[in-house]
Interface confidence: low
């Protein structure tokens, strides 16, 4: 029988009446066009909906926007278009919502061609009131809030000027011209690249990287010959052109660009790219594209300084620059990532790591599923997950994998069961243990969302026909009940619930079509009466994460510690509530060799946890490039995995000695602060002075092991045995350029621009 249809299901009684009393319809009084929706603040209940309808005419675009506001999680909406003077809002800039609970909103208006600058509407009271402000420039990008101070905004203009506001968009100042890319760093620091000659494209690889820590009063040039840069966790990355050819290398800084080290990664050519797949304060997952148009590359994981890298996964699927990758951080369990590899026969297979990239394996076949036609052996196959790549290929996959940090262990995804991803219609699968085991949850493709920290899962069938039924489960997808939310089916366009999965409200968006007109409509359903009571202590059970062998004393140890969570029992139908906090008890593990990655110059043979010296480096002094100086390494081959908290047990010795030799080739790090007026002469002078140093630097780098394509296989191959290798919350990337991506964030050295 289909999942959830058996007699064991604990069904919610009288749910139809309970849901009917909590279903709220809102019909939007305008033509269909497009709709965008944003939550303003956390747990405020405030939603802004912007509908736009535009007709492109020969000379200009005629358009109309309407702005609606709800303060009860979408149950009721009020038309507030008059607050923005009925102005046409540019949808490509979206609604710029301020960080945390600042209550700030910026809408960017469409203005007629002849105007001096653009226009924005600003609110700092959760969109109750808006102030119109005319800009002294035409914005090229959405306004970017400083993560530390929501009054500080930056924007790029169509003329490539970098503009900053210190009073939430009231006054603007152009702090620099000829800017290609700008990003907020920590402590209200701004990083940006500039071009000297023609344009961003023309100067690619000859850009300069600048930093200002005082909102444009003073500047420091922290790099030249820049192709692009990216921020991830506490790391600042720059891809830098080599002196002699068209290759480029990654340099990394952990002090905001004051000092740089050359990452021990292969260099890439013009047609290749680097991409930061994930990063936090401990480490980085870096994708390095393979030469040629292969559609794949290699994932490397970094040490705690972002300098020494270990090969993590070969043949990682990543199509073209800025293309698609399935790399997904499973946020519901520490250390878990899912991605796809391109096998030798060009089929796509899903791989999962439970230890932050130490070892990758196939996903276990769901118990309640048969192997499909892609399987050679009908009894042995794996689950393969559909993510961004499948969606880009227009397979029947409406959603990427879903996990939430506060719904511990739950992962929901479309997939197929066989030897590779199938083009057949997928089903929906769920894991309740962070990806170790899977169960088929729903037949066929669905939209799905998690409510009340996992207490409720909601799904809607993906169909080309109008729909009027929603499914919900109160037991992590084991049993499902259906509710008809309207008599008149609608063309469904999306499920919307407040980010963070704490809400008990779900909004079903769609449109109705009649002979002459079509209108936007939303149905908001509140599940609070389904979960009638608050959860108590008896509703929770203790669950040891990453537990695979209960008889093993070290069971559950990942990255040097194990975590026991209090989790809601599947049989409990109660509210976790908006204030629910995940209860976990961490416990330190004793160190074993699995808590260490192989140090520079060492590698792990397959199926062995010991690190052995690389034959080609035996007897050589181990030297590598750190903070622009040659370092001598005394090691017995091990380095603690970033973020590993183990104590006691095995404790390999390691020592690094500064050789006082400069080795950062072709990278400029002037110590001098540049003021606005004198920056160019100083840079030119330094560049001149540096030419000699650069040549010397190249020779040193060539002599030692600080660079060069031949180094690829010198990084520790950790696929087999690093058992304790996970990190928390790796979603710390600057994702401004990836608003269209779902399910992963990446910062590629090309599509940053």
């Amino acid at each position: 029988s289909a999942p959830g249809e058996d007699e064991e299901c604990g069904r919610v009684r009288d749910f139809v009446a309970k849901l009917a009393n909590n279903t709220h319809q809102h019909v939007f009084d305008d033509l269909r066009g497009s709709v965008s929706l944003s939550w303003v603040g956390d747990s405020t209940g405030v939603i802004l909906v912007l509908t736009t309808f535009h007709v492109p005419l020969v000379i200009m675009t005629f358009g109309q926007s309407k702005l609606y506001r709800s303060e009860d999680y979408g149950k009721n909406f009020k038309d507030i278009t008059d607050l923005i003077n009925n102005t046409f809002i540019r949808t490509e800039f979206g609604m710029a919502i301020g960080p945390e609970n600042s209550g700030k909103v910026v809408l960017t208006a469409e203005v007629s061609g002849g105007s001096r600058g653009g226009r924005i509407f600003r609110s700092s009271d959760f969109a109750k009131n808006f102030v119109q402000t005319d800009l002294p420039f035409h914005p090229l990008t959405q306004m970017m809030y400083s993560p530390q101070n929501s009054d500080y905004l930056l924007a790029l203009s169509t003329e490539n000027g970098l503009w900053v506001s210190k009073n939430f968009g009231g006054k603007w100042e152009e702090i620099h011209k000829a800017v290609c890319l700008a990003k907020w760093g920590s402590d209200n620091t701004i990083f940006f690249t500039t071009y000297a000659n023609g344009s961003c494209k023309a100067d690619l690889g000859a850009l300069e990287l600048w930093r200002t820590s005082d909102l444009g009063k003073s500047f420091k040039t922290i790099g030249v010959k820049i192709y692009s840069f990216g921020l991830g966790g506490r790391f600042l990355f720059a891809s830098v052109m080599a002196d002699k050819d068209t290759t480029r290398r990654i340099h990394v800084s952990t002090d905001q660009g004051d000092t740089w080290s050359m990452a021990q990664l292969p260099s890439v050519g013009q047609e290749q790219f680097y991409s930061i797949l994930a990063a936090n304060d401990d480490m980085v997952f870096m994708h390095v594209d393979e030469p040629g148009d292969t559609g794949f590359g290699t994932i490397f994981t970094s040490d705690d300084r972002g300098i020494v890298y270990s090969k993590s996964l070969d043949r990682h699927l990543y199509t073209t620059t800025g293309g698609e990758t399935d790399f997904t951080n499973v946020t519901s369990l520490r250390g878990v990532y899912i991605t796809s590899v391109l096998s030798e026969d060009n089929s796509i297979q899903t791989m999962i790591t439970f230890d932050q990239g130490g070892r990758w394996t196939h996903l276990r076949k769901p118990e309640n599923s048969e192997c499909d036609a892609t399987a050679k052996n009908k009894n042995e196959c794996s689950l393969h997950i559909h993510a961004s790549y499948s969606i880009s290929q227009k397979l029947n996959v409406p959603m990427a994998p879903l996990s939430e940090p506060n719904a511990v262990g739950i992962v929901i995804a479309h997939g197929s069961v066989g030897d590779a991803i199938s083009v057949m219609v997928p089903d929906v699968y769920i894991s309740d243990d962070g990806g170790y085991s899977w169960t088929k949850m729903l037949e066929g493709p669905h939209y799905y969302t998690i409510l009340d920290s996992g207490g409720i899962i909601v799904a809607i069938e993906h169909s080309s026909r109008p729909i009027n039924v929603i499914k919900f489960s109160t037991d992590e997808g084991q049993c499902w009940q259906t509710y008809t939310f309207t008599r008149d089916p609608i063309y469904f366009t999306g499920l919307a619930s407040e980010p963070g999965a704490r809400s008990m409200n779900i909004s079903i968006w769609g449109f109705t079509e009649s002979f002459l007109t079509s209108q936007w409509v939303s149905y908001t359903i509140d599940f609070k009466d389904i979960l009638e009571r608050n959860c108590e202590e008896k509703d929770y059970t203790i669950w040891l994460a990453h537990s695979t062998d209960p008889e093993d004393y070290e069971d559950g140890c990942i990255l040097g510690y194990k975590e026991a969570f209090l989790r809601l029992r599947k049989s409990s139908v109660c509210q976790n509530g908006r204030d629910y906090v995940v209860t976990k008890q961490p416990s330190i593990c004793l160190c074993s060799l699995e808590d260490f990655l192989c140090d520079f110059g060492y590698y792990r043979p397959e199926n062995d946890s010991k690190c052995v010296e690389q034959p080609e480096l035996k007897g050589h002094d181990l030297e590598f490039c750190l903070y622009g100086r040659e370092e001598h390494l005394t090691t017995n081959g091990y380095r603690k995995i970033p973020g590993d908290k183990c104590q006691g047990g095995v404790n390999p010795v390691r020592e690094v000695k500064d050789l006082k030799k400069k080795c950062t080739s072709n990278f400029l790090s002037p110590e001098k602060q540049n003021s606005k007026s004198n920056s160019v002469p100083i840079i030119l002078a330094i560049v001149g002075l540096m030419l000699v140093t650069v040549v010397a630097g190249v020779l040193i780098v060539k002599k030692y092991v600080c660079g060069g394509r031949f180094l690829v296989h010198r990084y520790s191959v950790l696929q087999q045995h690093a058992e304790a290798n996970g990190v928390d919350g790796v979603d710390a990337l600057d994702t401004a350029s990836h608003t269209n991506k779902s399910g992963y964030h990446d910062d590629s050295d090309e599509d940053l621009l």
């Epitope: 203790i542 040891l544 537990s547 008889e551 004393y553 194990k562 008890q585």
Partner: antibody, heavy 129, light 107 residues
Framework: QVQLVQSGAEVKKPGASVKVSCKAS????????MSWVRQAPGQGLEWMGI????????SYAQKFQGRVTMTRDTSTSTVYMELSSLRSEDTAVYYC??????????????????????WGQGTTVTVSS | EIVMTQSPATLSVSPGERATLSCRAS??????LAWYQQKPGQAPRLLIY???TRATGIPARFSGSGSGTEFTLTISSLQSEDFAVYYC?????????FGGGTKVEIK
Amino acid sequence: QVQLVQSGAEVKKPGASVKVSCKASGYTFTSRYMSWVRQAPGQGLEWMGIINPVGGSTSYAQKFQGRVTMTRDTSTSTVYMELSSLRSEDTAVYYCARDPSGIAAAGPASRYYYGMDVWGQGTTVTVSS
Amino acid sequence: EIVMTQSPATLSVSPGERATLSCRASQSVSSNLAWYQQKPGQAPRLLIYGASTRATGIPARFSGSGSGTEFTLTISSLQSEDFAVYYCQQARLGPWTFGGGTKVEIK
């Protein structure tokens, strides 16, 4: 050899507090948890709580919650157990015991349990007015 | 919390005879169970861990068995030094709990 040496006997008045120390030697202090167990005269063993010497995190039995505080000093490899608001029924011998537990009393220590393999000699605490 | 019940409370056995002590858990503790021996005026001493593994230095006459909720400590041939109180203890779920003890006395 591995040993746990506890502080000497104490006589306290009701309402007072007592702080018992337990000094570990012969092994890496941070590699094992430490449990405290007490035994009233003529009675059985009663587990009070556990401390993880690495971070100092603790877990106490419900009965002692709010009255017991377990701390550690890694520089001297010593753990301490302080019991406040003493009453006559707290008269007992208090033991520290090395406990290799993986999950400190938070649950499912669902893996091989090695038992409290090394015990202190015990500290007699008498509560009397 | 998990309640551990030991039986009998007192066991009278002659030296050289076999002694069988029982320990029952109110819910499954898997094999996360230990047995201790305590003599008057002394601290407890670990005998068995993991339900069935003898601790270092414990004579072979002591053996443990069981899993889940039912456990047994067997002393195959009682020696004079074995007359003491024996406690079982679970470490499956916090708080750790001990049984009430079984006193093995000379018959």
